[in-house]
């Protein structure tokens, strides 16, 4: 799996999970989230050569085609596979609210 | 929806469905498929600016982050959303076989 266990321990130019910390105020301009200040969102990046973690039959076809016609830019792309939620604390007036924001943290990647 | 009805009729540099014909023998080296000779596989391509058909909360966060930090290369990517199968005819010896190959045709796209 193209997850932290594999990707963070290997030098990998191909599609893999990459670490990324997001600071809500600095990076997104979101001032409404009280806690946490930021979080490890991670992201997916890297090349998708033939058979590298292909998600579907179409992505396998596309990566094979791309070896012949790279100028078409018709290659699969490295995107998130498994995502996890993030629990946040915010206020409505003086009332604290705890909420789970779904699909906020990328745990693994795929070529799609 | 970023499908043929929208994408093929508009000038759209952002993430959208693009037409692409794949010839099995010429483009993939697959000589085992007897019919069809090829098919309209399509593919997804284009930029994923903030809120352009974002798939998840993470892709929205990432596209917003990317507007502030474009040099980070941490942007969402334009990938397939809905896929359809393709029916093919091939031979085992002299016996014709009809089979459905799943997820062969892209019908719409998303930023993920």
């Amino acid at each position: 799996a193209l997850d932290a266990a594999y990707c963070f321990r290997n030098v990998q130019d191909n599609c893999c999970l990459r670490p990324l910390y997001i600071d809500f105020k600095r990076d997104l301009g979101w001032k409404w989230i009280h806690e946490p200040k930021g979080y490890n969102a991670n992201f997916c990046a890297g090349a998708c050569p033939y058979l590298w973690s292909s998600d579907t039959q179409h992505s396998r076809v596309l990566s094979l085609y791309n070896t012949i016609n790279p100028e078409a830019s018709a290659s699969p792309c490295c995107v998130s596979q498994d995502l996890e939620p993030l629990t946040i604390l915010y206020y409505i007036g003086k009332t604290p609210k705890i909420e789970q924001l779904s699909n906020m943290i990328v745990k693994s990647c795929k070529c799609s | 929806a970023l499908d043929a009805a929208y994408c093929f009729r508009n000038v759209q540099d952002n993430c959208c469905l693009r037409p692409l014909y794949i010839d099995f023998k010429r483009d993939l080296g697959w000589k085992w498929i007897h019919e069809p000779k090829g098919y309209n596989a399509n593919f997804c391509a284009g930029a994923c600016p903030y809120l352009w058909s974002s798939d998840t909360q993470h892709s929205r966060v990432l596209s917003l982050y990317n507007t502030i930090n474009p040099e980070a290369s941490a942007s969402p990517c334009c990938v397939s959303q809905d896929l359809e199968p393709l029916t093919i005819l091939y031979y085992i010896g002299k016996t014709p076989k009809i089979e459905q190959l799943s997820n062969m045709i892209v019908k719409s796209c998303k930023c993920s």
């Epitope: 016609n69 790279p70 100028e71 078409a72 830019s73 018709a74 | 994408c7 093929f8 009729r9 508009n10 000038v11 759209q12 540099d13 959208c16 693009r18 037409p19 692409l20 014909y21 794949i22 010839d23 023998k25 010429r26 483009d27 000779k37 309209n40 391509a45 284009g46």
Partner: antibody, heavy 119, light 107 residues
Amino acid sequence: QVQLKESGPGLVQPSQTLSLTCTVSGFSLTTYNVHWVRQPPGKGLEWMGLIWNTGGTRYNSALKSRLSISKDTSKSQVFLRMNSLQTEDTATYYCARDPVPNKWHFDFWGPGTMVTVSS
Amino acid sequence: DIQMTQSPASLSASLGETVTIECLASEDIYSNLAWYQQKPGKSPQLLIYDARSLQDGVPSRFSGSESGPQYSLEINSLQSEDAVTYFCQQHHAYPFTFGSGTKLEIK
């Protein structure tokens, strides 16, 4: 309906650069590929190169060092630039569209523009 | 590059006759062949693609066939407007190449 139309100078000096424009209507350059094909007077057709719907290019290796194809999708225009022109580059230059990218035959052509290379 | 050898260079036939123009590919092009008609001073018009598929709007008297590396364009019941030049084109591999053309005349 689908239309393509080439425009550019009718006469170019030897060693100079040729610049041609193909203006299209009835289809989008973000959907279809556009090719350039030329035909010397009384002779056959030569495929020069193409620009993909995604903006990538592919050139005939015989012309690659001299040729550049680009586009402005918002203006529905494709551009051809070829440098170091010689008299043998005298030809009618056509732009053409393939019906589906990667089909590689041409269902619509422009009327062509005649280019003479002469001093 | 794939060479397309087209024959004959010129051809004369009577109205109503059937004529055949041939193209020989220097290597296997897997039926990736198109035929075009070109009238004097005009751009080529697509007749046939994928060796035998008739382009929309093209009269059914035009047909394409293949036998190994040899590809043929057949024109049945020849009409006066058919007396123009015909080209084949391989759409199998870069660079896409054309035959040298066949000029068809009416006797």
